[in-house]
């Protein structure tokens, strides 16, 4: 009789996370009598996956009916595979004894787990920035395997080139993470813009995952101010308007000063929105000319989104 061989025909098996892995093993002889055990890894630190003789292995089932006469098939199925299950699995024949002793091992089957990357999460800078400034966006995705992955950045459908990407860890691991930082130059038209991080991986069957960030969360467009004097509405009254244009976000407080003294403060409410997503607002002030002997300096002072105030002044001539 030829000496028993343990045959593991598959050098490697690749399984998607959540599915079952079938690991094949047959022996070529009924001799010697003794159980089969499956291990992950080799050496003293190997992990017992299944023991035909004893133990409870809720995720493992035998593919064939191992109690049946002349059974020489000791293939197993491992359910609900996760990246942590990756490794090399050995089918090992033991010889009956007290205790049973290892007789012969198969060559091993390497199990690799295909795990989908998590949905990319894009985050922008903590503080808003103004047009012409460069801001950084980060994109992170985790838990994927194998390591090969492609990440692209887009702004409004246009691919970006100024970014740096790292996949960690560098060495072998059960799963991997990707981290990318892209630099984006803001323009005044970016209120409606989107930055998109796109991740392509073998597990996604050509349907990449996307994470987005709206530049409306990042950009601050400071207003332009224009103060104009309107024709007299009534005797001794002059209407002065302050046009606040092209600002974003909406949070804005306007203060009128007459010769440096606060006349009125108001918060932007009924604004009009421009096509590019910025806002316009207008405030007016009725000045009683008869109350003034001298010329009046009117100042429209605007505090936008918590930034230092900007102002525009207008000299109101008081004629004798």
């Amino acid at each position: 009789e030829e000496e028993l061989q343990v045959i593991q025909p598959d050098k490697s098996v690749s399984v998607a996370a959540g599915e079952s892995a079938i690991l094949l093993c047959t022996v070529t002889s009924l001799i010697p009598v003794g159980p089969i055990q499956w291990f992950r890894g080799a050496g003293p630190a190997r992990e017992l996956i299944y023991n035909q003789k004893e133990g409870h292995f809720p995720r493992v089932t035998t593919v064939s009916e191992s109690t049946k006469r002349e059974n020489m098939d000791f293939s197993i199925s491992i359910s609900n595979i996760t990246p942590a299950d990756a490794g090399t699995y050995y089918c090992v024949k033991f010889r009956k004894g007290s205790p049973d002793t290892e007789f012969k091992s198969g060559a091993g089957t390497e199990l690799s787990v295909r795990a989908k990357p998590s949905a990319p999460v894009v985050s922008g800078p903590a503080a808003r920035a103004t047009p012409q400034h460069t801001v950084s966006f980060t994109c992170e995705s985790h838990g994927f395997s194998p390591r090969d992955i492609t990440l692209k950045w887009f702004k409004n459908g246009n691919e970006l080139s100024d970014f740096q990407t790292n996949v960690d860890p560098v060495g072998e691991s059960v799963s991997y993470s990707i981290h990318s930082t892209a630099k984006v130059v803001l323009t005044r038209e970016d209120v409606h813009s989107q930055v998109i991080c796109e991740v392509a991986h073998v597990t996604l069957q050509g349907d990449p995952l996307r994470g987005t960030a709206n530049l409306s969360e990042t950009i601050r467009v400071p207003p332009t101010l224009e103060v104009t004097q309107q024709p007299v509405r009534a005797e001794n009254q002059v209407n002065v308007t302050c046009q606040v244009r092209k600002f974003y976000p909406q949070r804005l407080q306007l203060t009128w000063l007459e010769n440096g003294n606060v006349s009125r403060t108001e918060t932007a409410s009924t604004v009009t929105e421009n096509k590019d997503g910025t806002y316009n607002w207008m405030s007016w002030l009725l000045v009683n000319v008869s109350a003034h002997r001298d010329d009046v300096k009117l100042t429209c002072q605007v505090e936008h989104d918590g930034q230092p105030a900007v102002s525009k002044s207008h000299d109101l001539k008081v004629s004798a």
């Epitope: 009789e1 009924l30 001799i31 009598v33 003794g34 159980p35 023991n51 035909q52 003789k53 004893e54 133990g55 009916e65 191992s66 109690t67 049946k68 006469r69 002349e70 059974n71 009956k96």
Partner: antibody, heavy 119, light 110 residues
Amino acid sequence: QVQLVQSGAEVKKPGASVKVSCKASGYTFTNYWINWVRQAPGQGLEWIAMIDPSDSETHYNQIFKDRATLTTDTSTSTAYMELRSLRSDDTAVYYCAMDYGSLYAMDYWGRGTLVTVSS
Amino acid sequence: DIVLTQSPDSLAVSLGERATINCRASQSVRSSGYNWIFWYQQKPGQPPKLLIYLASNRDSGVPDRFSGSGSGTDFTLTISSLQAEDVAVYYCQHSRELPTFGQGTKLEIK
């Protein structure tokens, strides 16, 4: 280590039934066949039947097919052999034995249960 | 059914001498490349103990003075050098079909 612990001796009257138990430990009960063998006083070994606890598949010696019933309780890892319509020549030591290689052999044995049938 | 016949029924051998027990099957017990014959030793008041499986393979812990041989219908259990603790009844069993035992051979010291 594998252990098969059998129930205690029984004395039965002719025509009665007996149910012998065999509690297994030291291995996964559902992974190996259990055989039942008897030995009358001063006589040889006589195979009665075998059962696969994983699915209750059974094989019986034709001599015992109508009188013996093998069952298992996987929750307690216990095998049972019931013999009905007892006769005086059923007086014997009844053994359970585990088949470790699925070869229809008997690798590990219980210590036996003496069943005495007497009026 | 396959019937196993052992010979002799009893045997007396001197300590250190060779003991040979035969088992003949009424038809071949060879199948799938294996001879489905097993040998057991039973000492008084004890259950049987498996010695040899598939005709020629010693079970774990069995001293190497015990050996099994044969093929097809004729099989032999040999004890190369009889020891006092080998006094027992020896049984052959087949499992080519459902198991049956031979009638047993009583081995004693001469």
